[in-house]
Protein backbone atom coordinates (compact mmCIF):
# COMPACT_ATOMS: atom_id res chain seq x y z
CA UNK A 1 0.00 0.00 0.00
CA UNK A 2 0.51 3.81 -0.03
CA UNK A 3 -1.06 6.08 1.86
CA UNK A 4 0.90 9.18 0.67
CA UNK A 5 -0.80 11.47 -2.22
CA UNK A 6 -0.48 9.38 -5.15
CA UNK A 7 2.27 11.07 -7.40
CA UNK A 8 4.15 9.93 -10.25
CA UNK A 9 7.11 11.76 -9.10
CA UNK A 10 9.87 9.98 -7.10
CA UNK A 11 11.10 13.19 -5.28
CA UNK A 12 7.54 13.93 -4.67
CA UNK A 13 7.29 10.83 -2.70
CA UNK A 14 10.30 11.42 -1.02
CA UNK A 15 8.98 14.83 0.34
CA UNK A 16 5.95 13.33 1.17
CA UNK A 17 7.52 11.15 3.22
CA UNK A 18 9.54 13.14 4.49
CA UNK A 19 6.53 15.57 6.22
CA UNK A 20 5.45 12.60 7.28
CA UNK A 21 7.84 11.74 9.21
CA UNK A 22 8.05 15.03 10.77
CA UNK A 23 5.01 14.90 11.61
CA UNK A 24 4.77 11.67 13.22
CA UNK A 25 7.60 12.92 15.43
CA UNK A 26 5.55 16.71 16.56
CA UNK A 27 2.80 14.41 16.99
CA UNK A 28 4.46 12.15 19.12
CA UNK A 29 6.28 14.58 21.23
CA UNK A 30 3.21 16.42 21.69
CA UNK A 31 1.39 13.26 23.07
CA UNK A 32 4.89 12.18 25.26
CA UNK A 33 4.17 15.45 26.65
CA UNK A 34 0.10 15.33 27.56
CA UNK A 35 0.99 11.66 29.32
CA UNK A 36 4.32 13.65 31.48
CA UNK A 37 2.00 16.63 32.57
CA UNK A 38 -1.16 13.94 33.87
CA UNK B 1 29.89 1.83 4.32
CA UNK B 2 26.30 0.52 3.90
CA UNK B 3 26.14 -3.66 3.14
CA UNK B 4 23.29 -5.38 1.88
CA UNK B 5 23.95 -8.98 1.93
CA UNK B 6 20.71 -11.10 0.38
CA UNK B 7 19.25 -14.61 0.67
CA UNK B 8 20.82 -17.62 -1.55
CA UNK B 9 19.49 -18.85 -5.12
CA UNK B 10 16.13 -20.72 -5.36
CA UNK B 11 14.74 -22.94 -7.77
CA UNK B 12 10.80 -23.50 -7.80
CA UNK B 13 8.53 -24.37 -10.07
CA UNK B 14 5.52 -22.35 -11.77
CA UNK B 15 2.85 -21.11 -9.79
CA UNK B 16 4.92 -20.94 -6.68
CA UNK B 17 5.75 -17.75 -4.50
CA UNK B 18 9.42 -16.95 -3.38
CA UNK B 19 10.25 -14.21 -0.89
CA UNK B 20 14.04 -12.84 -1.11
CA UNK B 21 15.51 -11.22 1.67
CA UNK B 22 18.52 -8.03 2.20
CA UNK B 23 19.64 -7.34 5.23
CA UNK B 24 21.25 -4.02 6.16
CA UNK B 25 24.02 -3.09 8.25
CA UNK B 26 25.90 0.03 8.20
CA UNK B 27 22.76 2.65 8.00
CA UNK B 28 19.96 3.98 8.78
CA UNK B 29 17.71 1.58 7.37
CA UNK B 30 14.24 2.92 8.69
CA UNK B 31 15.07 6.15 7.22
CA UNK B 32 15.86 4.88 3.29
CA UNK B 33 14.52 4.08 0.55
CA UNK B 34 14.76 0.04 -0.12
CA UNK B 35 14.17 -0.71 -3.77
CA UNK B 36 13.84 -4.15 -5.65
CA UNK B 37 15.10 -4.45 -9.33
CA UNK B 38 15.79 -7.54 -11.15
CA UNK B 39 17.57 -8.51 -14.12
CA UNK B 40 16.65 -11.76 -16.48
CA UNK B 41 19.82 -13.60 -18.11
CA UNK B 42 21.94 -11.56 -20.66
CA UNK B 43 18.85 -8.66 -20.21
CA UNK B 44 18.52 -5.17 -18.64
CA UNK B 45 17.10 -4.04 -15.56
CA UNK B 46 13.63 -3.91 -14.55
CA UNK B 47 12.20 -1.99 -11.35
CA UNK B 48 9.90 -3.38 -9.07
CA UNK B 49 9.00 -1.50 -6.68
CA UNK B 50 10.44 0.23 -3.28
CA UNK B 51 9.07 0.68 0.56
CA UNK B 52 10.10 3.12 2.93
CA UNK B 53 10.16 0.99 6.25
CA UNK B 54 9.41 4.03 8.98
CA UNK B 55 6.07 3.81 7.79
CA UNK B 56 5.83 0.12 5.85
CA UNK B 57 5.02 2.49 2.65
CA UNK B 58 5.24 0.69 -1.01
CA UNK B 59 5.32 1.69 -4.45
CA UNK B 60 4.93 -0.39 -7.11
CA UNK B 61 5.44 -0.93 -10.48
CA UNK B 62 2.21 -1.50 -12.19
CA UNK B 63 3.71 -4.79 -14.16
CA UNK B 64 4.15 -6.42 -11.04
CA UNK B 65 1.19 -4.91 -8.80
CA UNK B 66 -1.16 -7.47 -7.18
CA UNK B 67 2.24 -10.45 -7.61
CA UNK B 68 4.94 -8.48 -5.94
CA UNK B 69 4.74 -7.65 -1.82
CA UNK B 70 7.59 -5.33 -0.38
CA UNK B 71 8.59 -5.70 3.30
CA UNK B 72 10.44 -4.85 6.07
CA UNK B 73 11.45 -5.80 9.40
CA UNK B 74 13.04 -2.53 11.22
CA UNK B 75 14.15 -4.86 14.51
CA UNK B 76 16.63 -6.82 12.01
CA UNK B 77 17.03 -4.34 9.53
CA UNK B 78 15.72 -6.35 6.87
CA UNK B 79 13.86 -5.85 3.24
CA UNK B 80 11.82 -8.54 1.83
CA UNK B 81 10.29 -9.10 -1.81
CA UNK B 82 7.81 -11.62 -2.33
CA UNK B 83 6.99 -12.58 -5.79
CA UNK B 84 3.99 -15.10 -6.24
CA UNK B 85 2.32 -16.81 -9.11
CA UNK B 86 5.87 -17.72 -10.81
CA UNK B 87 6.38 -18.24 -14.28
CA UNK B 88 9.29 -18.92 -16.45
CA UNK B 89 10.08 -15.17 -17.06
CA UNK B 90 10.65 -14.42 -13.84
CA UNK B 91 14.09 -16.04 -13.74
CA UNK B 92 16.12 -13.59 -13.13
CA UNK B 93 18.88 -12.37 -10.51
CA UNK B 94 17.14 -10.07 -7.70
CA UNK B 95 18.58 -7.09 -6.63
CA UNK B 96 18.05 -4.52 -3.67
CA UNK B 97 18.94 -1.32 -3.51
CA UNK B 98 19.39 1.71 -1.56
CA UNK B 99 18.13 5.20 -2.09
CA UNK B 100 20.82 7.97 -1.49
CA UNK B 101 20.62 11.71 -3.32
CA UNK B 102 17.61 9.83 -5.80
CA UNK B 103 19.49 7.14 -6.54
CA UNK B 104 20.77 3.93 -5.83
CA UNK B 105 24.27 4.27 -3.90
CA UNK B 106 24.35 0.42 -1.98
CA UNK B 107 22.97 -2.73 -4.23
CA UNK B 108 22.93 -6.34 -2.57
CA UNK B 109 24.92 -9.19 -4.17
CA UNK B 110 21.79 -10.58 -6.08
CA UNK B 111 19.81 -13.53 -5.57
CA UNK B 112 19.07 -16.02 -8.45
CA UNK B 113 15.62 -16.74 -8.84
CA UNK B 114 15.27 -19.94 -11.54
CA UNK B 115 11.91 -21.04 -12.55
CA UNK B 116 11.24 -24.55 -14.20
CA UNK B 117 9.26 -27.30 -13.74
CA UNK C 1 6.22 4.96 -18.79
CA UNK C 2 9.23 6.72 -19.40
CA UNK C 3 11.64 5.03 -22.13
CA UNK C 4 15.18 5.04 -22.30
CA UNK C 5 16.70 4.47 -24.94
CA UNK C 6 21.01 4.16 -25.11
CA UNK C 7 22.76 4.35 -27.72
CA UNK C 8 25.18 2.52 -29.10
CA UNK C 9 24.22 -0.91 -28.19
CA UNK C 10 28.03 -1.91 -27.63
CA UNK C 11 31.12 -0.46 -28.68
CA UNK C 12 34.48 -0.93 -29.07
CA UNK C 13 37.10 1.52 -28.48
CA UNK C 14 41.27 1.31 -28.11
CA UNK C 15 42.59 1.27 -25.15
CA UNK C 16 43.54 5.33 -24.28
CA UNK C 17 40.74 6.14 -26.68
CA UNK C 18 37.51 8.35 -25.82
CA UNK C 19 34.04 6.10 -25.69
CA UNK C 20 31.05 8.12 -25.79
CA UNK C 21 27.52 6.54 -24.80
CA UNK C 22 24.24 8.40 -25.24
CA UNK C 23 20.96 8.27 -23.50
CA UNK C 24 17.38 9.67 -24.05
CA UNK C 25 14.85 9.92 -22.45
CA UNK C 26 10.70 9.98 -23.95
CA UNK C 27 10.08 12.86 -21.35
CA UNK C 28 11.76 15.83 -19.86
CA UNK C 29 13.84 14.35 -16.65
CA UNK C 30 14.36 17.94 -15.12
CA UNK C 31 11.75 17.92 -11.59
CA UNK C 32 9.53 20.21 -10.20
CA UNK C 33 12.73 20.26 -7.50
CA UNK C 34 14.79 21.70 -9.86
CA UNK C 35 17.11 18.21 -9.89
CA UNK C 36 17.65 15.96 -12.77
CA UNK C 37 17.31 12.19 -11.65
CA UNK C 38 19.65 10.66 -14.45
CA UNK C 39 22.07 8.34 -13.10
CA UNK C 40 24.51 5.78 -14.89
CA UNK C 41 25.43 3.08 -13.56
CA UNK C 42 28.53 0.47 -14.36
CA UNK C 43 27.73 -3.24 -14.50
CA UNK C 44 30.90 -5.79 -15.02
CA UNK C 45 30.20 -9.38 -15.83
CA UNK C 46 29.31 -11.67 -12.32
CA UNK C 47 29.14 -8.48 -10.02
CA UNK C 48 25.75 -6.31 -9.04
CA UNK C 49 25.51 -2.75 -10.74
CA UNK C 50 27.66 0.19 -9.32
CA UNK C 51 26.53 3.65 -9.04
CA UNK C 52 29.03 5.98 -11.49
CA UNK C 53 27.14 9.24 -11.67
CA UNK C 54 24.11 10.37 -10.11
CA UNK C 55 22.29 13.96 -11.22
CA UNK C 56 23.51 13.97 -14.46
CA UNK C 57 27.09 14.60 -13.47
CA UNK C 58 28.19 14.28 -10.18
CA UNK C 59 30.70 11.31 -9.90
CA UNK C 60 30.58 8.61 -7.01
CA UNK C 61 33.38 8.92 -4.54
CA UNK C 62 36.33 6.84 -5.84
CA UNK C 63 35.04 7.12 -9.92
CA UNK C 64 38.14 8.12 -11.98
CA UNK C 65 37.63 11.47 -13.26
CA UNK C 66 37.88 10.26 -16.95
CA UNK C 67 34.52 9.30 -16.42
CA UNK C 68 32.12 12.17 -16.99
CA UNK C 69 28.27 12.56 -17.31
CA UNK C 70 26.44 15.74 -19.31
CA UNK C 71 23.03 16.53 -20.84
CA UNK C 72 19.88 17.88 -19.75
CA UNK C 73 16.33 17.76 -20.12
CA UNK C 74 15.99 14.56 -22.46
CA UNK C 75 19.31 14.00 -23.78
CA UNK C 76 22.42 12.91 -21.76
CA UNK C 77 25.79 11.70 -22.41
CA UNK C 78 28.48 9.22 -20.48
CA UNK C 79 32.07 9.77 -21.77
CA UNK C 80 35.37 7.91 -20.81
CA UNK C 81 37.89 10.38 -22.00
CA UNK C 82 40.90 7.39 -22.05
CA UNK C 83 39.43 3.98 -22.07
CA UNK C 84 40.75 1.80 -19.54
CA UNK C 85 41.32 -1.64 -19.94
CA UNK C 86 38.83 -2.09 -16.24
CA UNK C 87 36.32 0.16 -18.02
CA UNK C 88 34.86 -2.90 -19.77
CA UNK C 89 31.83 -3.50 -18.60
CA UNK C 90 27.58 -3.15 -19.53
CA UNK C 91 26.65 1.04 -18.80
CA UNK C 92 23.21 1.85 -17.57
CA UNK C 93 21.30 4.92 -17.89
CA UNK C 94 18.03 4.85 -15.82
CA UNK C 95 16.01 8.04 -14.25
CA UNK C 96 15.21 8.33 -11.12
CA UNK C 97 12.54 11.68 -11.80
CA UNK C 98 9.08 9.60 -12.40
CA UNK C 99 7.26 6.54 -11.28
CA UNK C 100 8.29 3.64 -12.65
CA UNK C 101 11.75 4.22 -12.47
CA UNK C 102 13.09 3.47 -15.74
CA UNK C 103 16.34 2.29 -17.27
CA UNK C 104 17.72 2.12 -20.61
CA UNK C 105 18.99 -1.36 -22.18
CA UNK C 106 22.06 -0.92 -21.58
CA UNK C 107 25.52 -0.57 -23.87
CA UNK C 108 28.56 -3.03 -24.05
CA UNK C 109 31.97 -1.02 -23.55
CA UNK C 110 35.15 -3.20 -25.19
CA UNK C 111 38.38 -3.52 -26.41
CA UNK C 112 39.11 -2.77 -29.98
Known amino acids: HSDGIFTDSYSRYRKQMAVKKYLAAVLGKRYKQRVKNK | EVQLVQSGAEVKKPGSSVKVSCKAS????????MHWVRQAPGQGLEWMGLIYPIFADTRYAQKFQGRVTITADESTSTAYMELSSLRSEDTAVYYC??????????WGQGTLVTVSS | DIVMTQSPDSLAVSLGERATINCKSS???????????LNWLQQKPGQPPKRLIY???TRESGVPDRFSGSGSGTDFTLTISSLQAEDVAVYYC?????????FGGGTKVEIK
Open chain 3, 94 to 102: WQGTHFPLT
Open chain 3, 55 to 57: LVS
Open chain 2, 26 to 33: GGTFSDSY
Open chain 2, 97 to 106: AIDYDGSFAY
Open chain 3, 27 to 37: QSLLDSDGKTY
